[in-house]
Amino acid sequence: KDDDDKVPQLYWDDLKKMLSEKLDTTDFTSTIKLLNENSYVPREAGSQKDENLAWYIENQFRECKLSKVWRDEHFVKIQVKDSAQNSVTITGTNSEFVYLVENPGGYVAYSQNATVTGKLVHANFGTEKDFEDLDSPVNGSLVIVRAGKITFAEKVANAESANAIGVLIYMDKTKFPIVDADVSFFGHAHLGTGDPYTPGFPSFNHTQFPPSRSSGLPNIPVQTISRAAAERLFENMEGDCPSDWKTDSSCRMVTSQNKSVKLSVSNVMKEIKILNIFGVIKGFVEPDRYVVVGAQRDSWGPGAAKSSVGTALLLELAQTFSDMVLKDGFQPSRSIVFASWSAGDFGSVGATEWLEGYLSSLHLKAFTFINLDKAVLGTSNFRVSASPLLYALIEKTMQEVKHPVTGLSLYQDSNWASKVEKLTFDNAAFPFLAYSGIPAVSFCFCEDTDYPYLGTTMDTYKELIEKIPQLNKVARAAAEVAGQFMIKLTHDVELNLDYERYNSQLLSFLRNLNQYRADIREMGLSLQWLYSARGDFFRATSRLTTDFKNSEKTDRFVMKELNDRVMKVEYYFLSPYVSPRESPFRHIFWGSGSHTLSALLEHLKLRKTNNRAFNETLFRNQLALATWTIQGAANALSGDIWDIDNEF
């Protein structure tokens, strides 16, 4: 091409304006509405309607003229309701009385199949603290808990730890103000993500793995019940619930004398084929480095807020970015992968299976995951959960994007980062971060209260537009947030990952650990090596910043080498000392298991509060392995081995 034909260089302000103008003309609500038409609803994972929507998305990606569109098939096990209904009954202690409370319309996937009978005890939300605070012992009893605050899986795991024999979950009117008390709802009880019968490895059809079972599966039955059913149970219970629970006045604590509750669950396992649909806009400089933008497609109920909003955002962003590239001269350096996952309702199964399939290589190529799920649940607040590597990017974006209703900047609190909540198991971003070591972000426009219809048959477009009349504006703002992330991550020469943020995370951990220095001394241990590792990490980040400053931005080779060092930061916080199969969420900050820094602190606390439960040998291991993981991250960031000070 002649010099005259050169595509003019587009700068951040040009791209930001371009994105904004394109989004101004996008009709998000009609796409959301389309995705909630009868031909696509309900779309339980693996169902015909889920597949119909997969085909539609694949078609749309092709019509967007993305560089490449493809699909991944996985064969996974889910749990569905049997034709024999699950039941909750009240019985007399002599079992002659059998009063049906409910044959629930919903269910909890991956529940243990069993029939259990016993006293029923209310355990509030079912958090660890809730169980600790109970006056009535729950061992040998069923527990009833409110939905909210933590995932179903965590509620069940906590109940199991307290030796409960079964769990009932309901939505109280105070937290979930749904008029119809008979509304049923759905969830899953796998304390993990992915197919629980192929833990830590992918479930492609041709992989001949031996039968296996995730340790995160519950060993007790669990069932969701309607509020009407809960109220009927409360009629047979006594003791008012504590006022600080802030729940319905009907709430009661424990079954009356001569009364028992019987829970019968008989769900069935079903192997299904799920489809993940992908489309890519290839980068112009480093096409083998990509940001992944994903959304859950399936849903047990209509799933308007749960999956249609995210899927609509995914489709519209694919169209917008394709137009920016093909028509408006945007040349992203790195690639953008658009992903539509299935079986999200069963614990981010589609997303996790993809990650498991490419475990050894994905962190070398994918440098960020942007989750679009449940991005619009209200209007009042903008909330975000993410890896600290993305905090700087998030802050810049919050300063740039205006609130869809107030018109003010989303950046209203300079202390926002300290209020960021950890990604939880029920978020598709969690496995990216905690399993694969890929920086991930999930955000939402939401209220102080939970969106009441998630996981229910009432999660319809009609209810969504009624709850959020300015749905189009809010969806547009969500698209702008994600779009700005995508531009900044693929356009800038220097990778927009703030590796220095982990210095303050490490410092915070050491501050917490330092409170127990007397205990550590008494065990004849020292924190010197941990401080040394932390110091090495700090020096490595400083050196990398200096290297960036001193490098020639036009030298692609040098910039790629520096960016590759940045890309490895998150990955190197995955503990190399635990098996991805036994402990898939290896991240020492954000994962789960005894290798995490929070587990180390919780364990050390026991030395004072419950000495019999404290295991010094285990603690010594935890401390040593945490130290080495941090040291390893420092070494990886430093670059080549001849640059690493090996005095350690």
């Epitope: 002659e96 059998v98 009063y99 049906l100 044959n103 009927r232 047979n236 004398q257």
Partner: antibody, heavy 118, light 112 residues
Framework: QVQLVESGGGVVQPGRSLRLSCAAS????????MHWVRQAPGKGLEWVAV????????YSADSVKGRFTISRDNSKNTLYLQMNSLRAEDTAVYYC???????????WGQGTLVTVSS | QSALTQPPSASGSPGQSVTISCSGT?????????VSWYQQHPGKAPKLMIS???KRPSGVPDRFSGSKSGNTASLTVSGLQAEDEADYYC????????????FGGGTKLTVL
């Protein structure tokens, strides 16, 4: 609204049989326990039989045991009482009643009169 | 003869309170809280007034209350009104070899 309508009563000779029906509407019949209660003319109430929501358990009073059988058809929302070997002392108004829980009969039919007489 | 013992009659003037007793044993009234009270007007089906000793179903005036002490249950009607004149029956579960529901012989309440 909840409605229970008994039918099948009448005059019958001792030793003969009769089948009472109770048609239910206005509630989820298949979810509730159902009872038959009788009342002899000018006398008090006497419990006759119970059947649990799914028909799994049935119990009857000693005075009718072996002669009367309670049953239900949840698909038809109907409760039945098969009365065999009828005696003069079985003469009464027979009521069907819904038991939401703990023997609290919150809805009753209008009753059907059974007269056992030769 | 009924297994639960009720007085055959009780009376009171409008506005007054009346209590009807229902005596049983430790195998029925005393052993379980499954005591109900029914009101029956002549020629009509019975109506549930109290369940589980003291629970009042919706629609029943709060003038009606139930209680239990030992093997005896009681129904109290306060602020008597003319329409309260009726027969009142107590019932209870009895723990025996056979599942059993007992009724009292009934109390005729007269409003003077």
């Amino acid at each position: 609204q909840v409605q229970l309508v008994e039918s099948g009563g009448g005059v019958v000779q001792p030793g003969r049989s009769l089948r009472l029906s109770c048609a239910a509407s206005g509630f989820t019949f298949s979810s509730d326990a159902m009872h038959w209660v009788r009342q002899a003319p000018g006398k008090g109430l006497e419990w006759v039989a119970v059947i649990w929501y799914d028909g799994s358990n049935k119990y009857s009073a000693d005075s009718v045991k072996g002669r009367f059988t309670i049953s239900r058809d949840n698909s038809k929302n109907t409760l039945y009482l098969q009365m065999n070997s009828l005696r003069a002392e079985d003469t009464a108004v027979y009521y069907c009643a819904r038991d939401r829980q703990w023997l609290a009969f919150d809805y009753w039919g209008q009753g059907t009169l059974v007269t056992v007489s030769s | 003869q009924s297994a639960l013992t009720q007085p055959p009659s009780a009376s009171g003037s409008p506005g007054q309170s009346v209590t009807i007793s229902c005596s049983g044993t430790s195998s029925d009234v005393g052993g379980y809280n499954f005591v109900s009270w029914y009101q029956q007007h002549p020629g009509k089906a019975p109506k549930l007034m109290i369940s589980e000793v003291s629970k009042r179903p919706s629609g029943v005036p709060d003038r009606f209350s139930g209680s239990k002490s030992g093997n005896t249950a009681s129904l109290t009607v306060s602020g008597l009104q003319a329409e309260d004149e009726a027969d009142y029956y107590c019932s209870s579960y009895r723990d025996s070899n056979n599942f059993d529901v007992l009724f009292g012989g009934g109390t005729k309440l007269t409003v003077l």
